[in-house]
Amino acid sequence: SDKLYQRKEPVISSVHTKVKGIAEVTENVTEGGVTKLGHSIFDTADYTFPLQGNSFFVMTNYVKSEGQVQTLCPEYPRRGAQCSSDRRCKKGWMDPQSKGIQTGRCVPYDKTRKTCEVSAWCPTEEEKEAPRPALLRSAENFTVLIKNNIHFPGHNYTTRNILPTMNGSCTFHKTWDPQCSIFRLGDIFQEAGENFTEVAVQGGIMGIEIYWDCNLDSWSHHCRPRYSFRRLDDKNMDESFVPGYNFRYAKYYKENNVEKRTLIKAFGIRFDILVFGTGGKF
Amino acid sequence: SDKLYQRKEPVISSVHTKVKGIAEVTENVTEGGVTKLGHSIFDTADYTFPLQGNSFFVMTNYVKSEGQVQTLCPEYPRRGAQCSSDRRCKKGWMDPQSKGIQTGRCVPYDKTRKTCEVSAWCPTEEEKEAPRPALLRSAENFTVLIKNNIHFPGHNYTTRNILPTMNGSCTFHKTWDPQCSIFRLGDIFQEAGENFTEVAVQGGIMGIEIYWDCNLDSWSHHCRPRYSFRRLDDKNMDESFVPGYNFRYAKYYKENNVEKRTLIKAFGIRFDILVFGTGGKF
Amino acid sequence: SDKLYQRKEPVISSVHTKVKGIAEVTENVTEGGVTKLGHSIFDTADYTFPLQGNSFFVMTNYVKSEGQVQTLCPEYPRRGAQCSSDRRCKKGWMDPQSKGIQTGRCVPYDKTRKTCEVSAWCPTEEEKEAPRPALLRSAENFTVLIKNNIHFPGHNYTTRNILPTMNGSCTFHKTWDPQCSIFRLGDIFQEAGENFTEVAVQGGIMGIEIYWDCNLDSWSHHCRPRYSFRRLDDKNMDESFVPGYNFRYAKYYKENNVEKRTLIKAFGIRFDILVFGTGGKF
């Protein structure tokens, strides 16, 4: 609340997060031309990345392009990419949607379709839909511990969201435990009015807002955080503006002296922790 | 503009970036003592890293030290590092400029020079100039889509830089399309009065400032971003303060049961997205 | 100092850090059942990660779980995890403390203990103490160069912490060289009243505060940074809230066509650079 006689100062904040949970993933795995169901376990080292500070990422879905090699190959026949003769292919051209540089030749992609040959990581990534339901949909049950240290340097005041009296096996609840700083990911989405299972397919960005409204006067001292949640990406976004949240990364390796990579298109939730507020003192 | 009767509130911001583009890199590759021209393709998974929020990095140049192994070897004969006898080499000494710990012996580096032997990743990194022109100089034509969600919690107001009416194939232009949030990297540099080709060699830091000056009164509502660009690293910086922008990272692997690494010194542009501004309401 | 007639504006900041130093690590290495002392060298590419902006991380300690494979195995017999019959093990159950999903069977862990079998990365991570003293305790002697560019857009004023007159071989000292922006990690801890050797074992978070109190009036212009240091993690934190600072990451590889990983639990210091202050002008 506004106390006009107080000197207000914005919060200086530092955040540390720790995600916990294991996901069992079942997917079709093709080896030697045979496709079978594969089961695998993902733990924190597999689905999250050592990221700094105010953001953390949880992978909820992925598409893999395995064994890519730098060579020539036909590009993926996405809409408008097919050709019938070399005239349609321009040597040196880089289509922003494509994954390589055209050689100028129109070559067979499969028995019915031809596309421009490219110099690229081959075979080029197939533009297939993200798996539905999401492969790591059980990430809904993961939890995140959020530690927040705040400072009002002008008032020489420091505190944190976790107090010595708190119980490390609590789970945040708006009504029953609003000061617990261990959050179930599914609950965060529910609080924000969003459907985790749905967002997990394409990924998204979720804001965890921590609001500190601190009265630092000794006679009416109050300084505790208030947590709220809102979705930050635009779920109604046009396809051309890349809806959801994903990024590509690669694992490089050598096989028979050939440099190869596995390309992973990782979809997931980026959680942004947005800390704001003021400290007021007479 | 300052409206003194308004209650002003600083912006709470979340940013999401997506880089697009492919680079063809031509460089000398030595295999089995034979040097030949090698061509390779770099896509987003090769030149950028899954980074959070308000920064993204585009690699524009690199120097590789391949096949390093932990062992003993002569250190690189940079200025002042040569020796003529063991007296010049101090067992256990770590020169901040060196890449290893001295054994106390002065050994031949090549047929004319001797340097102190070190325990290090060997052969130690050669202190050679970054390639000129930069290997990924064509990154000038890459584009970045910037999505920015902002919030004024006190005014309970949220908006974003991308509106439903926007066209996903636009490119930002100060005059013709100042609201488009897809930026060509070369244009960002041009706007900032900098030469991309030059900066790409050693790397640098470029600021993309997004200024929201929001009038949230219903009768004169205005809340759109203004983009501006400025270089953040000091181009006139003394050599001792490490000009440009680079970092080293390693790819580890095993060969014949020996742990090896390829060390990459990556030069590039770090783009910092600096969002600021206020929301004012009566 | 407060000049009430001035128009105050918060600082917009960009930070770039560069860590220097080499650590010699001595640890027990087991190969083919034989344990011997192993010596290795860690340089920046080994102990730090290419992180953005306002944070950097220095690994000071680690625990490795080598050669893990996705299969079935007994879980680690931590407190309360032992079993005597299958009744104690629940098929499909994921204990948040465990590293896998239970199969429902109680199996021998060693000759005296039985635990629930899990589907996991096997053998599961042993819950052993972080090595004491810390393996990279010599990181105390590493240095970090901090470059900080600041901007007051409303006043159209930009400056940075490194001036052309500065000496690149300086080291920060509160009294003798308070403007030098090269900091010895051990000195940062000493200034904050903390013991580096102790914190290095479990890890921690250290704040480097850069305070800009800028008077931009031409007749009494002053705009230089003031550095201060404080520990941000809670050293008295209850075990259940994960004291210190660590994260897990994995190195994946194939051996005889089997997908394997080495899991590294990295303990270290995350340094958060907190830039704040105002620029005032008549």
Epitope: G33, G67, V69, T71, L72, C73, P74, R105, V107, P108, Y109, D110, K111, E117, C122, P123, V258 | - | -
Partner: nanobody, 115 residues
């Protein structure tokens, strides 16, 4: 699924030559040859992209074997000369999406190099 039929295998003396041919039931971007010796894993021998660009050879056969293909007929052939006893194997024709990536294999044809 692509059907592949190999021909041309047989017994040949060390230093001799042999030409293997393969016909595919449909056009594909790349065609190549693999071989498998008794007790060993299948290994890559040679590959050709569309119109013979690019070509790729295993180090062990470089300079001795030549791959060529006829796009119009969906065929590929492997001219082998300077044959050695260690070239003895079943040779498989394969098709795929690049000279490094193969999805379909034929039944194989036996090549034996012996005096």
């Amino acid at each position: 699924e692509v059907q592949l039929v190999e021909s041309g295998g047989g017994l040949v003396q060390p230093g001799g030559s042999l030409r293997l041919s393969c016909a595919a039931s449909e056009r594909t971007y790349s065609m190549g040859w693999f071989r498998q010796a008794p007790g060993k894993e299948r290994e890559f021998v040679a590959g050709s992209g569309w119109d013979g660009i690019p070509t790729r050879y295993a180090d062990s056969v470089k300079g001795r074997f030549t791959i060529s293909r006829d796009n119009a007929k969906n065929t590929v052939s492997l001219q082998m000369s300077g044959l050695k006893p260690e070239d003895t194997a079943i040779y498989y024709c394969a098709t795929g999406t690049s000279v490094y990536h193969y999805q379909y294999w034929g039944q194989g044809t036996q090549v034996t190099v012996s005096s």
